[in-house]
Every structure is written in C-alpha cells, then in structure tokens.
C-alpha cells in the first residue's frame, strides 16, 4: 500500500477581480482496488448514494475528473447498493480518472479496497482519513473549482498552477 501524495489547487476570486491560488498538500494511500498511477483532474464531490443509480437519463459525459466520496458509517447504510469497489468502478465508468474515498467514518472500507481483486481498476483508487481527510473535505465543501493531482512520489515543489 503505497503512499499517495495529493496536491489540491483552489482558485479564489476577490472583489477586485484578481485570483489567489491556494495549494494544499495531503497524503493518502493507493488501494489494491486500483492502479498505482499519477492522475489529475477537477474534483467532484460525490454522495455515496449518487453512485447507486445508473444515470441512464444522462446523454452527456465529462471525462478526467477526480471523484471524492465521503463514506458514511456502516450503520447508516446497512444494505449498500454497491460495495466500495463497486462505487469506485461506477465513478470510473462515468468518467472519473481517479477516486478518493474519505474512510474516516468507515475504516472497514480500507480492507474492502485492499482485498486482492482479480480485476482491479486501471485508474487510482486512493483512501484518506484523519487530518488529511478533513483538509480535503474542507476544500470540497467550498463549492469552488478545485483541481487535484495525485502522485506516487512526493512533489518536488509546491505547484501554483497546473493545466488539465
């Protein structure tokens, strides 16, 4: 289980029309459910239940985004529609280039993601918890455009801007 180095860039606009770029670094773990690869894209907050339906009514797709899913306590969802791995697969089918799970409320999900899968995803599936998860969710909850870069080695230097 290798360390995943996640760099999140958030753009904030000011009343003067200028922009400030904030870069936040956090760490997670690559799970065996996916590939140990670098990936980058715009962050999309996904509710676990949002990965249940097939969204067959949608006829447009976007590709190359990073799905962030905050898993709930197992007691709140005793009969989940999909396994955690199934949810990761569904996100990738919908165009995600990587999936990050916040497992703080559901640490059992770590074992589920690390059970050897015969058919692992070809995209990274990362899990975060604790202070790193809090940092990530604080950014996601701003409803502002945020972009993530996932790397399997530490970034050489903080990057102020990157182009997706």
């Amino acid at each position: 289980k290798e360390t995943a180095f996640v760099e999140v860039v958030l753009f904030e606009s000011s009343p003067s029309g200028d922009y400030t770029t904030y870069t936040t670094g956090l760490t997670g773990r690559f799970s065996r459910a996916g590939a140990t690869l670098s990936a980058e894209g715009e962050i999309v907050q996904m509710h676990p239940l949002g990965l249940c339906n097939n969204n067959d009514e949608e006829d447009l797709y976007e590709y190359g985004w990073v799905g962030v899913v905050k898993l709930e306590q197992p007691e709140l969802d005793p009969k989940p529609c999909l396994t955690v791995l199934g949810k990761a697969k569904r996100a990738v089918q919908r165009g995600a280039t990587a999936v990050i799970f916040d497992v703080s409320e559901n640490p059992e999900a770590i074992d589920q993601l690390n059970q050897g899968s015969e058919d692992p995803l070809k995209r990274p599936v990362v899990y975060v918890k604790g202070a790193d998860a809090i940092k990530l969710m604080n950014i996601v909850n701003k409803q502002k455009v945020a972009r993530a870069r996932i790397q399997h080695r530490p970034p050489r230097q903080p990057t102020e801007y990157f182009d997706m």
Epitope: F11, S13, Y19, E42, V44, Q45, M46, H47, G50, N53, N55, E57, E58, L60, Y61, E62, W65, R94, G95, N141, K142, Q143, K144, V145, D163, M164
Partner: antibody
Framework: QVQLQQSGAELVKPGTSVRLSCKAS????????MNWIKQTTGQGLEWIGI????????NYNVRFKGKATLTVDTSSSTAFMQLSSLTPEDSAVYYC?????????????WGQGTLVTVSS | DTVLTQSPALTVSPGERVSISCRAS??????IHWYQQKPGQQPKLLIY???NLASGVPARFSGSGSGTDFTLTIDPVEADDTATYFC????????FGTGTKLELK
Amino acid sequence: QVQLQQSGAELVKPGTSVRLSCKASGYTFTHNHMNWIKQTTGQGLEWIGIINPGSGGTNYNVRFKGKATLTVDTSSSTAFMQLSSLTPEDSAVYYCARNLITIAGPFAYWGQGTLVTVSS
Amino acid sequence: DTVLTQSPALTVSPGERVSISCRASEGVSSYIHWYQQKPGQQPKLLIYKASNLASGVPARFSGSGSGTDFTLTIDPVEADDTATYFCQQSWIDHTFGTGTKLELK
C-alpha cells in the same frame, strides 16, 4: 429527460425582495449542482452563484454577494433564489442552469427563464 | 475576472462556412463552452470543453482551440442557425463572452 421549470414573471417595486423558483425533474436533484445566471441587454450573461443541493453549500460571484441568496428544498426538488433590496438595475431575465458533472463543466440544462422587472 | 472577447456580428450566406472567435484575457485551458440563443429562448449548449459536441447538436457545429483562442465553426450554415452565439469559460468561476449575432443574407 432533465427539465428545469422556473416560476413566472415578476413586477416588483424598488427596495423590495423577490424569490424565484426552479423545479427540477428527470434526475436525482441532490446529485448535481445548480447555478443561477442573470441576462440583461446591457451586461449580457452573468453568473450569480452555485448551490450544491446535497449539502446546501453555496458559492457566489463576488458581485452578487449580499444581493442574491440561494437555497433549495430537496423534498420538492426545487432551487430558490432570493434577490433583495431591488433596484431597476436588477431588472433582467434570470435562469437556473444545471451543471453536467463537474462544477467547471458546462451548463448542460437551462430553465426557461424568469423575467424580473423592477419599477415604481 | 477572465474577459472573453467576441466579435459583435457576422453576416453569411446559407451553405457557407462561418467561424466565430472567442479570445480569453488569460489562459483557460480547454474550459470553454459554446451556447446558441434564439430570441425569447434560453441558451442551448452546443460545444463543451472546447471541442465536445453536445448531444442532439448537428455535426455541422464544431469547436477548437485551447489556452486563449477558441473558435466555433458552422459548416455549412443553415437558415435555422440565425441566433446569438456565446462562449463561456469555467477555468476559474464562470464568465461569458458578449455574444456574436449571426445573421444570414
């Protein structure tokens, strides 16, 4: 199919407030962000702000902070925008528009628009 | 704010090829979307992320560009294409171009 149905035209007096609605159907309301956009002949199209119906979280264009307030009622799959302290410059057509998937994605689905006229 | 500049109007004949330009004041990667708006109607998505055709949109419409210069091309133009065309960037927040009014001879 995805549909956004907006409330009817409003004629209001300066200094008052107005609340516009946008009823969503054809998809799970809490799974996609909703935006509001203003259109005038002089200023063209201006993005007002965005709301995440799942969490209620909002982000506003700095020019509309204090002017617009975005809310949702998930039980009726309806988004609302309240405009306060109205002036004639607020006269415009206001649209709700749903993102595709990402916040920075396109406005894939639009309501038909609500005309607001501010006049004494 | 990122300012998007469009030429105000174009007049072409049916059957011709027309290119509508959109220039951003700063780089926006490929985060440009194009909309068509007819009088009394809401805008309709044509192209997203610079070059992706929205569903139900005829293949006569195409988009290109990245960084600061983008183009919407209609080839061939049909009478029904009379409308105003807006570009929009979403690299940081959302801003729209002023619109290009397309008229047919």
